[in-house]
Amino acid sequence: IWELKKDVYVVELDWYPDAPGEMVVLTCDTPEEDGITWTLDQSSEVLGSGKTLTIQVKEFGDAGQYTCHKGGEVLSHSLLLLHKKEDGIWSTDILKDQKEPKNKTFLRCEAKNYSGRFTCWWLTTISTDLTFSVKSSRGSSDPQGVTCGAATLSAERVRGDNKEYEYSVECQEDSACPAAEESLPIEVMVDAVHKLKYENYTSSFFIRDIIKPDPPKNLQLKPLKNSRQVEVSWEYPDTWSTPHSYFSLTFCVQVQGKSKREKKDRVFTDKTSATVICRKNASISVRAQDRYYSSSWSEWASVPCS
Amino acid sequence: RNLPVATPDPGMFPCLHHSQNLLRAVSNMLQKARQTLEFYPCTSEEIDHEDITKDKTSTVEACLPLELTKNESCLNSRETSFITNGSCLASRKTSFMMALCLSSIYEDLKMYQVEFKTMNAKLLMDPKRQIFLDQNMLAVIDELMQALNFNSETVPQKSSLEEPDFYKTKIKLCILLHAFRIRAVTIDRVMSYLNAS
């Protein structure tokens, strides 16, 4: 058993049929010694008396808010949560496996630049009685500070018969140098509580590996005389690290119709302009990627050909 | 501690091409090592990230773009002094700071070159003959060092009398290649910045 936060405790249980469970001793936070009784949740049934209560925690029915009273007055509370371990593996029932970039990916994180700011998100099908708490650091043995905000519900989607909820959190490394060469990874830890179930999820990464620039901005077209060709120009996204001559991007320019199966023109360039062949009913799209360290491409920025 | 904005004329910077070749060569070598040593811990997640130049050179700090010198987090650098005469310095106006940056890059390359050559000598003794260093990568390191053209004491190649542990050598190769790729990215960024300035 360990304390998650004040008056909230996590009981770690090996979860298998007829498991013996864990013996837990609760102590009432009071100077009083006599006349103390214990109850669980909203029940008025007295579970025991005295300053301490010893219970055998085996299942979710044994978890919940234990309260000690004296003469109708509440003295203190202890909330017990269960953390299940099945076949030596901690449960991951609360969050959905996003399977990208690999199986057992519950947390996904991205950074728009090298400033030390990043966003992580996760998915769940649970809509109520759900809380998240996020902590982060650079390195684990001698951790350096990373400050995370509160996790918020950022999107709701319908997937078949199910509703899917996306939560996200923004974090900022306390003292980040965009030009630094990372040798210790960022660690992100998410505590998830659904009703009386506790789970924790972690992710470890270097900022350089989660870079995904914003799409290029200000796409403009200039038809070339006596030619099917069009000059397309754009600018670096505002959110990208500066100076751009140090933090350079490379670009992919594509002309394509509405269907992915349609024919296309595609060219890669380090410049902020390119010449492509425009077709009726097609769009010109441009996306960006760090020129020197190949992490993710940005989303496309698009303009119609006409 | 930082790169000045008034540096060589565009297109007059011979090291840019070499640094691009360097990043390409080390990236290819790292990819080859990951594939060949698939049953060894050779991915970024599996290895310890070590920097053999730590406390010996200060490339990131010495080569910091002027725009980042206002960032306090970028300025906790170690002061290191280097010899300052390089052929990549294509302008007479080149500052001492830029010379310091380029000489720091030269020292990095020299240290990695020695490590890689020592390691290759060990790998050539491996009866499995599983992996060797790409000669192209070693040649590209050499070309960039020649383009930088700094006079520097030659570092003797480390020789070892004991029987090499090939498993450890291959893991060390992975560690070295990961670190060198990160440094090659920094070098490429620096050369691009200098070329544009």
Partner: antibody
Framework: QVQLVQSGAEVKKPGSSVKVSCKAS????????LHWVRQAPGQGLEWMGW????????EYAPKFQGRVTITADESTSTAYMELSSLRSEDTAVYYC???????????WGQGTLVTVSS | DIVMTQSPLSLPVTPGEPASISCRAS??????LHWYQQKPGQAARLLIY???QSISGVPSRFSGSGSGTDFTLTISSLQPEDFATYYC?????????FGQGTKVEIK
């Protein structure tokens, strides 16, 4: 399976014209760009131009501009390359090639030898 | 026009040995480079597109690398069927241009 079948060899006199055909099978004809590339004996490959069969748009290499005409007939899934004012240095194998991507070629025809000789 | 220069023009190789062909562009072309194989009397066959992207059906011993002006096609272990002429082609700008070709011959 996508295939490009070209017309047979031709012998032409200098100053005349030649029209080579390229019939496509497998896949929708207008879903691909079609190019013409030639190869003189013992020489390398030389790009001549492309057509978008969907709308008839064409683009030619400056070297052949005014002398080459690429056309396409959607009803027969056939593309044509006509080269006029032939000279001896136009003796070459002419290939048609296609792709959904405009700038490179993933399927090639078997080639048509055009010999220009007096 | 962008000029593509291949080297060597002739490459004698022992079967089973690796082979590398170089292609250099007269100006930077990013990764807009493609590789083809051509055997005598046959049409060309696409091997690699956009410098390093492999084609399904092409053996994994063929790989490409490079960007900017310098590119390499590598055949990790030459098989008898690989003796042919190899061409690089740039697609950075029109007109599309090819290298002169590299003939890989049996040593």
């Amino acid at each position: 399976q996508v295939q490009l079948v070209q017309s047979g060899a031709e012998v032409k006199k200098p100053g005349s014209s030649v029209k080579v055909s390229c019939k496509a099978s497998g896949g929708t004809f207008s879903d691909y760009y079609l190019h013409w590339v030639r190869q003189a004996p013992g020489q390398g490959l030389e790009w001549m131009g492309w057509i978008d069969p969907e709308n008839g748009d064409t683009e030619y290499a400056p070297k052949f501009q005014g002398r080459v005409t690429i056309t396409a007939d959607e009803s027969t899934s056939t593309a044509y390359m006509e080269l006029s004012s032939l000279r001896s240095e136009d003796t070459a194998v002419y290939y048609c090639a296609r792709n959904k991507e405009l700038r490179y070629f993933d399927v090639w025809g078997q080639g048509t030898l055009v010999t220009v000789s007096s | 026009d962008i000029v593509m220069t291949q080297s060597p023009l002739s490459l004698p190789v022992t079967p089973g040995e690796p082979a590398s062909i170089s292609c250099r562009a007269s100006q930077s072309i990013s990764i807009n480079l493609h590789w083809y194989q051509q055997k005598p009397g046959q049409a060309a066959r696409l091997l690699i597109y956009f410098a390093s992207q492999s084609i399904s059906g092409v053996p994994s011993r063929f790989s490409g690398s490079g960007s900017g002006t310098d590119f390499t096609l590598t055949i990790s272990s030459l098989q008898p069927e690989d003796f042919a002429t190899y061409y690089c082609q740039q697609s950075n700008s029109f007109p599309l241009t090819f290298g002169q070709g590299t003939k890989v011959e049996i040593k």
